[in-house]
Amino acid sequence: ALDAAYCFRNVQDNCCLRPLYIDFKRDLGWKWIHEPKGYNANFCAGACPYLWSSDTQHTKVLSLYNTINPEASASPCCVSQDLEPLTILYYIGNTPKIEQLSNMIVKSCKCS
Amino acid sequence: ALDAAYCFRNVQDNCCLRPLYIDFKRDLGWKWIHEPKGYNANFCAGACPYLWSSDTQHTKVLSLYNTINPEASASPCCVSQDLEPLTILYYIGNTPKIEQLSNMIVKSCKCS
């Protein structure tokens, strides 16, 4: 799997999980989240050569086509596969609220 | 939806469905498929600015972050959403076989 266990420990220019910290106020301008200050969101990046963690049969077709016709820009792309939620604390007036924001943390990647 | 009905009728630089014909022999080197000779595979391409058909909350976070730090290459990517199978005819010896290859045709796209 193209997850932290593999990607963070290896030199990998191909599609892989990359670490990325997001600060809510600084990076997104979100001042309504009280806790946490930020979180490890991660992201997916890297090349998708033929058969590198291909998501579907179409992805395989496209990556094979792309090797022959690179100028067509019809290549697969490295995107998130498994995502996890993030628990946040915010206030409505003086009332604290705890909520789970779904699909906030990328755990693994794929070529699609 | 970023499908043929919308994308093929509009000039759209952002993420959208793009037409692409694949000839099995010429483009993939697949000589085993007897019929069809090729098919309209289509593909997804284009920019993913903030809130353009965002797949998940993480996609929204990433596209917003990317406006501030484009050099991070941490931007969402335009990928396939809905896919359809393709029915093919091939031979094992002299025996014709009909099979459905799943996820061969892209019908719509998303930013992920």
């Epitope: 963070f8 290896n10 990359r18 670490p19 910290y21 890297g46 | 050099e71 290459s73």
Partner: antibody
Framework: QVQLKESGPGLVQPSQTLSLTCTVS????????VHWVRQPPGKGLEWMGL???????RYNSALKSRLSISKDTSKSQVFLRMNSLQTEDTATYYC?????????????WGPGTMVTVSS | DIQMTQSPASLSASLGETVTIECLAS??????LAWYQQKPGKSPQLLIY???SLQDGVPSRFSGSESGPQYSLEINSLQSEDAVTYFC?????????FGSGTKLEIK
């Protein structure tokens, strides 16, 4: 363990180009960002620029026209090139890593390499 | 660029005392502040990040705090090895900027 080490010429002529190498071990350049920071003798620290794990770069606007940062991930090396050097560029040059990309503080530093600009 | 005004430039204190070094940011940096210790001829070492988070392996006598745009580094029970130079750094906006440094001496 995580290590960074700078190397390059100790002496550079004015108007010439400075080339420095930062060789890292214990982590991958496709995972972490690397920054360059310099410190003139007896003075404070100046952030120069960084190279992202994905290869993108960002420079201090005061140095942008003269500065270039690149890397060779397979060799675990980051390179700094700065042209049109003047005596005020005399400094110790450090490479440093941020603990998570976009955290922007530096948890590991190289020992530094002293560069003197003089004729 | 965000200016970081660090004070005092130098400071003298006795062993066992508590000392405070301050940094004033020219604009809101939302707690994105780090503190470093630098020994002569050595590279800086991270002490504190996010204004108050202690870096792994750093003694607990070091602590960080904030009050509006003012950020502080406090060193309790001063020891002889603490007599070096300290820098603050804002990690909020490009270009990342440092304070001018505080040289701490033992009386």
């Amino acid at each position: 363990q995580v290590q960074l080490k700078e190397s390059g010429p100790g002496l550079v002529q004015p108007s010439q180009t400075l080339s420095l190498t930062c060789t890292v071990s214990g982590f991958s350049l496709t995972t972490y960002n690397v920054h360059w920071v310099r410190q003139p003798p007896g003075k404070g620290l100046e952030w120069m620029g960084l190279i992202w794990n994905t290869g993108g770069t960002r420079y201090n606007s005061a140095l942008k026209s003269r500065l270039s940062i690149s890397k060779d991930t397979s060799k675990s090396q980051v390179f700094l090139r700065m042209n049109s050097l003047q005596t005020e560029d005399t400094a110790t040059y450090y490479c440093a890593r941020d603990p998570v990309p976009n955290k922007w503080h530096f948890d590991f530093w190289g020992p530094g390499t002293m560069v003197t600009v003089s004729s | 660029d965000i200016q970081m005004t660090q004070s005092p430039a130098s400071l003298s204190a006795s062993l066992g005392e508590t000392v405070t070094i301050e940094c004033l940011a020219s604009e809101d940096i939302y707690s994105n502040l780090a503190w470093y210790q630098q020994k002569p001829g050595k590279s800086p070492q991270l002490l504190i990040y996010d204004a108050r988070s202690l870096q792994d392996g750093v003694p607990s006598r070091f602590s960080g705090s904030e009050s509006g745009p003012q950020y502080s580094l406090e060193i309790n029970s001063l020891q002889s090895e603490d007599a070096v130079t300290y820098f603050c750094q804002q990690h909020h906006a490009y270009p990342f900027t440092f304070g001018s440094g505080t040289k701490l001496e033992i009386k």
